[in-house]
């Protein structure tokens, strides 16, 4: 299971951020930690797969991405549909395979070096980016390094984990990615046990560093299994 | 290159609605999300509005919270501002503008709510 | 609300010299999420600096940023005529988005 959690990597003891609130379709909720929204099967993988309602692509898997199922569907009925391959018809870059980017309509090889300048400018320019994913796993191919002068530091925009320096991951930010640090040894994480039960978050931190994984706490007892705290441990 | 161009302001009274636009050009706008910053005559800037790059989540400062309402139409690379319930604070100027830490911004628009 | 304070309110200065602003934060950013911005009169503003000290492209080497904590600074190393004009900061740590009230460098 992939590793995220609502609050930012960064924000330990501040109080839950006040005066925004996310819209999601058809609801109202307050931009504060704790709220899980609907939808999405994005950080786990689905043994049996079953069509998840979604409204943004990040929040499918790494080969999905968030549309109706039909044609000129209901826009208000979204799940996430299994990615377009190379040579197929696309609207957005998150239509397209892993390696792939979406070009004049079609989904074409990001090996390219013309897919530098599709996305624009650099890297640290770009901002909404909801179709990156929320882990250390790159939704996209990384970019060639001659394409961009340096790799983004803490605080900097970036559209996937690749395109963060080392030690850092790309993570979910209000409406926008930034590098944040990965998670070290003794440090709160989060694992979302439920299919069904993780959607769009407005914070996340990192998944925890190499050797390390998310685990339930030692010693932490709590009535509910639920809200047991978990942290990054040694494997 | 990257262009914003905001559009529709203008006088209205208090109580009165406004639709801002925003076209924008020289990017792949439905990658993008947007926000809306405001600028009263002579004063500093104050965030107003975010919104994703697919339009489905919004963001909004409590002094425009439930008579602002932020949307998006990807088809046209365009961005709105609908503002309700204006009142006299609401004079400003509005700027539309590209990512969380706005690198790029629109010229502006004056929106000026007075009887 | 984060409530960003910057200093001096007015910095009076010739070009050729040294510019330091200070962004002062009512919590702790923890992490480097801040932005300064440059505005000139009937201009919309620009951005110079992102992630407290990351410049932004086409933004000269003599800008730079630093700071962290509550504590952020912007430094015009040798300021040029075209420098003068008014500078603000912006948290992006946690909602609302909040800017400093602006610092306003100019000749003496």
């Known amino acids: 299971t992939l590793n995220s959690v609502l609050n930012s990597n960064a924000i330990k003891n501040l109080p839950p951020p006040l005066g925004g609130a996310a819209g999601h379709p058809g609801s109202a909720v307050s931009a504060a930690p704790g709220i899980l929204y609907p939808g999405g099967n994005k950080y786990q993988t689905i043994d049996n797969y079953q069509p998840y309602p979604c409204a943004e692509d990040e929040e499918c898997g790494t080969d999905e991405y968030c549309a109706s199922p039909t044609r000129g569907g209901d826009a208000g009925v979204q799940i996430c549909l299994a990615c377009r391959k190379r040579r197929k018809r696309c609207m957005r870059h998150a239509m397209c395979c892993p390696g792939n980017y979406c070009k004049n309509g079609i989904c074409v090889s990001s090996d390219q070096n013309n897919f530098r300048g599709e996305i624009e400018e650099t890297i640290t320019e770009s901002f909404g980016n909801d179709h990156s994913t929320l882990d250390g796993y790159s939704r996209r191919t990384t970019l060639s390094s001659k394409m961009y002068h340096s790799k983004g530091q803490e605080g900097s925009v970036c559209l996937r984990s690749s395109d963060c320096a080392t030690g850092l991951c790309c993570a979910r930010h209000f409406w926008s990615k930034i590098c944040k640090p990965v998670l070290k040894e003794g440090q709160v994480c989060t694992k979302h046990r439920r299919k069904g039960s993780h959607g769009l978050e407005i914070f996340q931190r990192c998944y925890c560093g190499e050797g390390l994984s998310c685990r339930i706490q030692k010693d932490h007892h709590q009535a509910s299994n639920s809200s047991r705290l978990h942290t990054c441990q040694r494997h | 290159q990257v262009q914003l161009v905001e559009s529709g302001g203008g006088l209205v009274q208090p109580g009165g609605s406004l639709r801002l636009s925003c076209a924008a050009s020289g990017f792949t706008f439905n990658n993008y999300g947007m926000t809306w910053v405001r600028q009263a005559p002579g004063k500093g800037l104050e965030w107003v509005s975010g919104i994703s790059g697919s339009g489905s989540y919004t963001y909004y400062a409590d002094s425009v919270k439930g008579r602002f309402t932020i949307s998006r139409d990807n088809s046209k690379n365009t961005l709105y501002l609908q503002m309700n319930s204006l009142r006299a604070e609401d004079t400003a100027v509005y700027y539309c503008a590209r990512t969380i830490y706005m690198d790029y911004w629109g010229q502006g628009t004056l929106v000026t709510v007075s009887s | 609300d984060i409530v960003l304070t910057q200093s001096p309110a007015t910095l009076s200065l010739s070009p050729g010299e040294r510019a330091t602003l200070s962004c002062r934060a009512s919590q702790n950013l923890f992490s480097p999420y801040l932005a300064w911005y440059q505005q000139k009169p009937g201009q919309a503003p620009r951005l110079l600096i992102y992630?407290?000290?990351n410049r932004a492209t086409g933004v000269p080497a003599r800008f730079s940023g630093s700071g962290s904590g509550t504590d952020f600074t912007l430094t015009i190393s040798s300021l040029e005529p075209e420098d003068f004009a008014v500078y603000y900061c912006q948290q992006y740590m946690t909602l609302p988005l909040t800017f400093g009230q602006g610092t306003k460098v100019e000749i003496n």
């Open positions: 992630g407290a000290s």
